[in-house]
Interface confidence: low
């Protein structure tokens, strides 16, 4: 997260760290007791490493009573996701067992009504992604409030040049932005999960390259079918 600040500890109990061989790789969001939603591209970077999900964390390194690392029983990328595109960049991870819920671990309601978030709406994005262009990684969860950007502006040739489909949304990226390592994390508007940070190699913090988020409402049928 660029230009953000440290989050209040355990105030986002839905927040997950998708890890490979014990290292944070991507963000994720607990959407059901046994399911974490993340970005499909995150798996590409996992290679053959052991994928696990950390829940109930604020600090990645420090012991915390609510922290628990879960093995992944099943990884389900969206069937139309491709390595060379950010389209359908969603991944559902089934935990080896139902998460132990509590004040620091709780699923987040996700948007089912397929309607664009009003441009200008302030939404919260959180993650353990880099906090500087130099690539500094935080130990504790960071977050930032970002205004939703309308699709017409986001699709300008100087911005994302028509790449933003109706199944995506954008948020402003003027110095405050999601970045590498935040992919798969939640964009939360009004207490509801609206978007998932896409995992392209986008430049961060440049207002001409807004953050791109996959709209979960557009994939309600797929999410429901996997969770069923």
């Amino acid at each position: 997260i660029l230009g953000g600040r440290e989050a209040e500890a355990h105030a986002r109990p839905y927040m997950a760290s998708v890890q490979v061989n014990g290292e944070h790789l991507c963000g994720g969001v607990l959407v059901a007791e046994q399911w974490v939603l993340s970005a499909a591209h995150c798996l590409e970077d996992a290679a053959d490493g052991k994928v696990q999900v950390l829940l109930g964390a604020h600090s990645l390194s420090q012991p915390e009573p609510s922290k628990r690392l879960y093995d992944v029983l099943r990884a389900v990328p969206h069937p139309d996701s491709r390595p060379d595109t950010i389209d359908h960049d969603l991944l559902l991870l089934q935990l080896s067992e139902k998460a132990t819920l509590g004040p620091a671990v709780r699923p987040l309601p996700w948007q089912r009504v397929d309607r664009d978030v009003e441009p200008g709406t302030l939404c919260d994005v959180a993650g353990w992604g880099i906090v500087s262009h130099a690539g500094r990684r935080p130990d504790r969860l960071q977050h930032v409030l970002l205004p939703v950007l309308d699709r017409a502006t986001c699709n300008r040739r100087t911005h994302h040049d028509g790449a933003i489909t109706q199944r995506m949304m954008c948020a402003e990226s003027n110095r405050r932005d999601s970045c590498k390592g935040d992919s798969g994390g939640p964009l939360v508007c009004g207490g509801v999960l609206e978007g998932v940070v896409t995992s392209g190699s986008r430049v961060c913090g440049n207002r001409k390259k807004p953050g791109i988020y996959t709209r979960v409402a557009s994939y309600a049928a797929w999410i429901d079918s996997v969770l069923a």
């Epitope: 309308d150 699709r151 017409a152 699709n155 040739r157 100087t158 028509g162 933003i164 109706q166 001409k208």
Partner: antibody
């Protein structure tokens, strides 16, 4: 296929107004801004302004403030440009464009003559 | 506003000849926002080159664009009959976006 359909030529009297439609098809109307450009006979192009169909936000070229009014009708995926208090200086072809100038309408010739 | 000056205003070229059109800006423009259009009589302008050097869809590979700062150019490596047209440069680094007066390119 992205199409921007403009109306046919207009012959108008000095002092009158004209409203030029630009009907968009082949893409989601709210996904791109609509730009308007003027081309006087045998001359270069002048940017008039642009409008964001999502929220009606408009940028005008200062030169055309008071002369041009840009609007959109989302329900019909149509952008409009109204030109008022017309003089012979306003005789020109007017184009709408979208996708940051990747797509243009066929142009509407406005002739101002008594 | 930024003034774009194109030269030459008129040019005649033989088939196979290399052609270079230039566009000079009154102040520095971002290469991301420097475009070129081709226009033939009675037709709308067509986006030809965007962001200084990127060819628009369907534009032949004999066209190229380059430049930075205040100096930009469009080059045709080998002139063909279908390239005869007017070419306009365009910037939108700053508002209002502006266009050059154009270069009319004829086949000799």
């Amino acid at each position: 296929e992205v199409l921007l359909q403009q109306s046919g030529p207009e012959l108008v009297k000095p002092g009158a107004s004209v409203k030029i439609p630009c009907k968009a098809s082949g893409y989601t109307f709210t996904d791109y801004n609509i730009d308007w450009v003027k081309q006087s006979h045998g001359k270069s192009l002048e940017w008039i302004g642009d409008i964001n169909p999502n929220n009606g936000g408009i940028n005008y070229n200062q030169k055309f403030k008071g002369k041009a009014t840009l609007t959109v009708d989302k329900s019909s995926s149509t952008a409009y440009m109204e030109l008022r208090s017309l003089t012979s200086e306003d005789t020109a072809v007017y184009y709408c464009g979208t996708g940051d100038y990747a797509y243009w309408g066929q142009g509407t010739l406005v002739t101002v003559s008594a | 506003q930024i003034v774009l000056t194109q030269s030459p205003a008129f040019m005649s070229a033989s088939p196979g000849e290399k052609v270079t059109l230039t566009c000079s800006a009154s102040s520095s423009v971002s290469s991301s926002y420097l475009y070129w259009y081709q226009q033939k009589p009675g037709s709308s302008p067509k986006l030809w080159i965007y962001s200084t050097s990127n060819l628009a869809s369907g534009v032949p590979g004999r066209f190229s664009g380059s430049g930075s700062g205040t100096s930009y150019s469009l080059t045709i490596s080998s002139m063909e009959a279908e390239d005869a047209a007017s070419y306009f440069c365009h910037q939108w680094t700053s508002y209002p976006p502006t266009f050059g007066a154009g270069t009319k390119l004829e086949l000799k």
